[in-house]
Interface confidence: medium
């Protein structure tokens, strides 16, 4: 049988066929910034080019003995996970290694920066196909390391990094906290977050997704045919780097934003036991385990969206939190969430020529989160329409009045500290789907977009008595773009999207003791793009033999048993 | 291969202009900031990444590095430019005493300075 981790990332349809042939990822170059490696190991021989780049600090301790196999251990294993002949994810990917970690696995921010600069200069001197950079390392939060990653990402390079092994918020570490980097946490064979001694995988809003990272069989530097099991978020990141290489090889023109959205879309959803994470981090941590797409065809028509959480605003009265989408993404809706329920809603606003989502804390609140719904919508033209507080009993309304514009999201923001229980009507008038409805004391913001073939509809799920959680999901073929709550009363903690489901959270009735606040309705806006579907069908008609589909079915390989060395 | 030093005379000229009070002052209203790792054991004091404003050219980076060396020398401090960055971020990596941070933050073109720190295999 194939190792558990390779089975886990393989789409169910292909599990019986074992795994993919050795040419996956062949158009892609993966740079590895790590320890030195044993490049003549049979798993990676001829696949990894050792560059002359080396920038490492002196090893600690006077009694340290440099042993080649120990010096090469971490990097060799990861190179094997990415592109190893037998135990690799992208068996066709070629790799280049840079040494930025010493024999004790320690490096410096400055050495890593110089390494990233080296990659950029190499890319300029000799432009090749798609580049993936794997950073299986972590240090404390570093503004400069994050900035360098941002610059490299904006130059078209896909960066994948380890979330960190500190059982902590990944946002406190770099490069894990860099928004442009794909940050990967680790899960085990039971889809549980990985525990590493007293610590374990990092978590939180800075993690993009999880991947296998415990008991991963890969190349051992003990001998040229040895294998070993290793664990960590580095191993998880190596899986995602391999998957990225496969995707980019099948679709070399994918942008970073498109790749990230696809990684999220094709991940296994809601399989991680969130109880392992600290309670306050559960809602922020993506419940996603990376997997290869079943094929590239059929992905193009999809309207891809992801949820981006802001940092916590902090508790001061006028504190705000801002969530931003990536440069190539459209902000289609904005919502907010506060654990205490004390918030003053959210609004979409322009910042530097781009829409951002800003949430507002309220007096006595412990702070808020802004939640952006970020989507890939080519040729989109989006704007925000605002209606000030109506003061009328019917509540505030705003709709998309421009020809060809559809409603993708509703936000509401109020200046009063507590909206109380003044309820606007829950049901919007029939025949007006392009309308946002809100509390009469709130200003309402409608996100209105025009894009070829874009169509949207509103779905509501109302519950007569207050409940801790109300959800509504978009059906197959439709993508959730907007998620909000009706009414915006004080017992509603907020609304946010989890994959294709809109979740509205309310205060626990047992703690408030009040049931008088009435119904809560989750409002989802579900969209699809007929234009993307059409383009995809045309592409399928004219293209053959380039999808992952074809790669999988081209050849079946056997899993070779080797003598395994375990730590 | 780069020769950062250009002309040695420039160092002496920079020194003189400092003494004459002619040194270029940082742009008004912009204050460079200092950052360091929140995890104390991971800090590497004595080595600093000086990040310059986005549109700074390589020649300006080199000039700023030389100016720092000249101003530090006047105060009896040695500085060692370990690397000049260009391609991703403009700036330079410098080995120097932490006593010079205040001075370095006032240099023209400086956006922020970050103390070097450790990273670890995960």
């Amino acid at each position: 049988s194939i190792p558990w981790n390779l089975e886990r990332i393989t789409p169910p349809r292909y599990r019986a066929d074992e795994y993919q042939p050795p040419d996956g990822g062949s158009l892609v170059e993966v740079y590895l910034l790590d320890t030195s490696i044993q490049s003549d190991h049979r798993e990676i021989e001829g696949r990894v080019m050792v560059t002359d780049f080396e920038n490492v600090p002196e090893e600690d301790g006077t009694r340290f003995h440099r042993q080649a196999s120990k010096c090469d251990s971490h990097g060799t294993h990861l190179a094997g996970v990415v592109s190893g002949r037998d135990a690799g994810v992208a068996k066709g990917a070629s790799m280049r290694s840079l040494r930025v970690l010493n024999c004790q696995g320690k490096g410096t921010v400055s050495g890593t920066l110089i390494g990233l600069e080296f990659i950029r200069k190499s890319q300029l001197v000799q432009p090749v196909g798609p580049l993936v950079v794997l950073l299986p390392l972590a240090g404390g939060y570093s503004r400069v390391l994050n900035a360098a990653c941002q610059r490299l990402a904006r130059a078209g390079v896909v960066l994948v990094t380890a979330a960190g092994n500190f059982r902590d918020d990944a946002c406190l570490y770099s490069p894990a906290s860099a928004p442009e980097v794909i940050t990967v946490g680790a899960t085990n064979a039971q889809d549980q977050p990985v525990t590493l001694g007293t610590l374990g995988t990092n978590f939180g809003r800075c993690v993009d997704l999880f991947a296998p990272g415990e008991d991963i069989i890969g190349a051992s530097s003990d001998c040229s045919t040895c294998f070993v099991s290793q664990s960590g978020t580095s191993q998880a990141a190596a899986h995602v780097a391999g998957i990225a290489a496969m995707m980019l090889s099948a679709e070399p023109e994918l942008t970073l934003a498109e790749l990230r959205q696809r990684l999220i879309h094709f991940s296994a959803k809601d399989v991680i036991n969130e109880a392992w994470f600290p309670e306050d981090q559960r809602v922020l941590t993506p419940n996603l385990v990376a997997a290869l797409p079943p094929s590239t065809h059929g992905a193009g028509w999809q309207l891809f969206c992801r949820t981006v959480w802001s940092a916590h605003s902090g508790p001061t009265r006028m504190a705000t939190a801002v969530a931003r989408c990536a440069p190539d993404e459209e902000l289609l809706s904005c919502s907010s969430f506060s654990r205490s329920g004390k918030r003053r809603g959210e609004r979409m606003e322009a910042q530097g020529g781009k829409l951002v989502c800003r949430a507002h804390n309220a007096f006595g609140g412990e702070g808020v989160y802004a939640i952006a719904r970020c989507c890939l919508l080519p040729q989109a033209n989006c704007s925000v329409h605002t209606a000030p507080p109506a003061e009328a009993s019917m509540g505030t309304r705003v709709h998309c009045h421009q020809q060809g514009h559809v409603l993708t999201g509703c936000s509401s923001h109020w200046e009063v500290e507590d909206l109380g229980t003044h309820k606007p009507p829950v049901l919007r008038p029939r025949g007006q789907p392009n309308q946002c409805v809100g509390h009469r004391e709130a200003s309402i913001h409608a996100s209105c977009c025009h894009a070829p073939g874009l169509e949207c509809k509103v779905k509501e799920h109302g519950i007569p008595a207050p409940q801790e959680q109300v959800t509504v999901a978009c059906e197959e073929g439709w993508t959730l773009t907007g998620c909000s709550a009706l009414p915006g009363t004080s017992h509603v903690l907020g609304a946010y999207a989890v994959d294709n489901t809109c979740v509205v959270r309310s205060r626990d009735v047992s703690t408030t003791g009040s049931t008088s606040e009435g119904a809560v309705t989750a409002v989802a806006i579900c969209c699809r793009s007929r234009h993307l579907a059409q383009a995809s069908q045309e592409l399928q008609g004219s293209t053959s033999g380039s999808g992952l589909n074809d790669i999988f079915e081209a050849q079946k390989i056997e899993w070779h048993e080797h003598h395994h060395h375990h730590h | 291969q780069e020769d950062e030093d250009g002309d040695y005379e420039e160092l002496v000229l920079a020194l003189r202009s400092e003494e004459d009070g002619l040194a270029e002052a940082p742009e008004h209203g912009t204050t460079a900031t200092f950052h360091r790792c929140a995890k104390d054991p991971w800090r590497l004091p004595g080595t600093y990444v000086v990040v310059l404003k986005e549109e700074t050219h390589l020649s300006q980076s080199e000039r700023t590095a030389r100016r720092l060396q000249a101003q530090a020398a006047r105060r009896g401090y040695l500085t060692k430019i370990l690397h000049v960055f260009h391609g991703l971020l403009p700036g330079f990596l410098v080995k120097m005493s932490g006593d010079l941070l205040e001075l370095a933050l006032k240099l023209p073109h400086v956006d922020y300075i970050e103390e070097d720190s450790s990273v670890f295999a995960q």
Epitope: - | L78, K80, H83
Partner: antibody
């Protein structure tokens, strides 16, 4: 132990080039700057230049700027100094030296054994 | 360039003598001065760094002093193995420069 081992003696004709190597052992090569210093027969020491730990940054004595190239190959822990357009007054012993940085001080703590280069027609 | 003028260029002394070598910089080099010892056919060896700090393993009879432009290397009690040539070096600014050397010979 920490040492720098240089390549053997060279005899060159005027106008030719010479490339001297300096192999490091006993320490992490990429942690230290390497300097090159020469000494003409019966004369004092003359600093030629330096190459930083990652080989990405060099500084030269203006006197040699147009003729000297300094490189390093981290995979074999070796630094190189190439001097072109040789003249008879380039006849000297060429040393590589490791620069050690300690707090606010630095100095050459380890020297190679020297490479004699003779330029003669 | 900063010129380091070393004096004397040579001196004769006996075992047990106190020997003083001076080095004068053409401009302020603060304390960025090192002293090296070189024996015939050998490479230089570091004795003193930052004007007055004795390098690891260097006997205590060697000491350095000075700052700014005037520097001194003192051997308090000359030993047979100390007969060699001594060089001062400034590393305050580029290009690094050395003194002309002082040859210490047996009287």
């Amino acid at each position: 132990q920490v040492q720098l081992v240089q390549s053997g003696a060279e005899v060159k004709k005027p106008g030719a080039s010479v490339k001297v190597s300096c192999k490091a052992s006993g320490y992490t090569f990429t942690g230290y700057t390497i300097h090159w210093v020469r000494q003409a027969p019966g004369q004092g020491l003359e600093w030629m230049g330096e190459i930083n730990p990652s080989g990405t940054y060099t500084k030269f004595n203006q006197k040699f700027k147009d003729r000297v190239t300094m490189t390093r190959d981290t995979s074999i822990s070796t630094a190189y100094m190439e001097l072109s357009r040789l003249r008879s007054d380039d006849t000297a012993v060429y040393y590589c030296a490791r620069e050690r940085i300690y707090s606010n001080y630095w100095f050459f703590d380890v020297w190679g054994q020297g490479t004699t280069v003779t330029v003669s027609s | 360039d900063i010129v380091m003028t070393q004096s004397p260029s040579s001196l004769s002394a006996s075992v047990g003598d106190r020997v003083t070598i001076t080095c004068k910089a053409s401009q302020n080099v603060y304390t960025a001065v090192a002293w090296y010892q070189q024996k015939p056919g050998k490479s230089p060896k570091l004795l003193i760094y930052s004007a007055s700090n004795r390098y690891t393993g260097v006997p205590s009879r060697f000491s350095g002093s000075g700052s700014g432009t005037d520097f001194t290397l003192t051997i308090s009690s000359l030993q047979p193995e100390d007969f060699a040539t001594y060089f001062c070096q400034q590393y305050s600014s580029y290009p690094y420069t050395f003194g002309g050397g002082t040859k210490v010979e047996i009287k």
